[in-house]
Amino acid sequence: AVSEHQLLHDKGKSIQDLRRRFFLHHLIAEIHTA
């Protein structure tokens, strides 16, 4: 699982790339994206 902490501290990523990774994780884990 990709934690929010990992994603937000992953330097050099665009905001869309973070959203992209969150959404891909959401499709697998069905975690609410709000």
């Epitope: 665009s14 891909l24 499709l27 697998i28 884990a29 069905e30 994206t33």
Partner: antibody, heavy 118, light 116 residues
Framework: QVQLVESGGGVVQPGRSLRLSCAAS????????MSWVRQAPGKGLEWVAT????????YYPDSVKGRFTISRDNSKNTLYLQMNSLRAEDTAVYYC???????????WGQGTLVTVSS | QLVLTQSPSASASLGASVKLTCTLS???????IEWYQQQPEKGPKYVMD???????STGDGIPDRFSGSSSGAERYLTISSLQSEDEADYYC?????????????FGGGTKLTVLG
């Protein structure tokens, strides 16, 4: 290896309905989001629908919202696309695709052709 | 809105290199995109995802002749040592989530011809 096999295509009159199926094998179907992408004859690709691993979340573009419904039966390893109120512009090859943790459409089937014509 | 622009066609000789371009709408210049290959009469195949910094991850079975790079709003797919089987349509695509809605768009595709 990942295998996705679409079926259910054919010729249908405008305004009628059709249900496509995608039989999945070679992976744990219930662990991944799935999508449908279509391609009109001689044209480019268009995303049609996406569903989460357990089926709780679905997503559609405006072009099919309210007419198409994506669903899945994880006990049968099968993805579905229910298409209602079909139009001539829905004529296309319909592909199912599987996500990975890294990308949306990592694996694709060979497609099934839907022709909407009177 | 989110738009991807591709040249309709490209050609290069067998064994040579070719660089295909996908241009994001200016306000989306930082976005990560995906590249897909579609050989004649076949389903599409995932090639790679490509980030704004040029880093990329390739799909299963994609040879290392395929590489990606980025400059501003442009995303490039470079194929070196061209083989006849590289003749195909190449599409870029990009997805985003806005207000809990998902959107995914494809470019119009580039038809690559490998000259004998």
């Amino acid at each position: 290896q990942v295998q996705l096999v679409e079926s259910g295509g054919g010729v249908v009159q405008p305004g009628r309905s059709l249900r496509l199926s995608c039989a999945a094998s070679g992976f744990t179907f219930s662990s991944y989001g799935m999508s449908w992408v279509r391609q009109a004859p001689g044209k480019g690709l268009e995303w049609v629908a996406t569903i989460s691993s357990g089926g709780s979340y679905t997503y559609y573009p405006d072009s099919v919202k309210g007419r198409f419904t994506i669903s899945r039966d994880n006990s049968k390893n099968t993805l579905y696309l229910q298409m209602n109120s079909l139009r001539a512009e829905d004529t296309a090859v319909y592909y199912c695709a599987r996500q990975t943790t890294m990308t949306y459409f990592a694996y694709w089937g060979q497609g099934t052709l839907v022709t909407v014509s009177s | 809105q989110l738009v991807l622009t591709q040249s309709p066609s490209a050609s290069a000789s067998l064994g040579a290199s070719v660089k295909l371009t996908c241009t994001l709408s200016s306000q989306h210049s930082t976005y990560t995109i995906e590249w897909y290959q579609q050989q004649p009469e076949k389903g599409p195949k995932y090639v790679m995802d490509l980030k704004q910094d040029g880093s990329h991850s390739t799909g299963d079975g994609i040879p290392d002749r395929f590489s990606g790079s980025s400059s501003g709003a442009e995303r490039y797919l470079t194929i070196s040592s061209l083989q006849s089987e590289d003749e195909a349509d190449y599409y870029c695509g990009v997805g985003d989530t806005i207000k809990e809605q998902f959107v995914y768009v494809f470019g119009g595709g580039t038809k690559l011809t490998v000259l004998g």
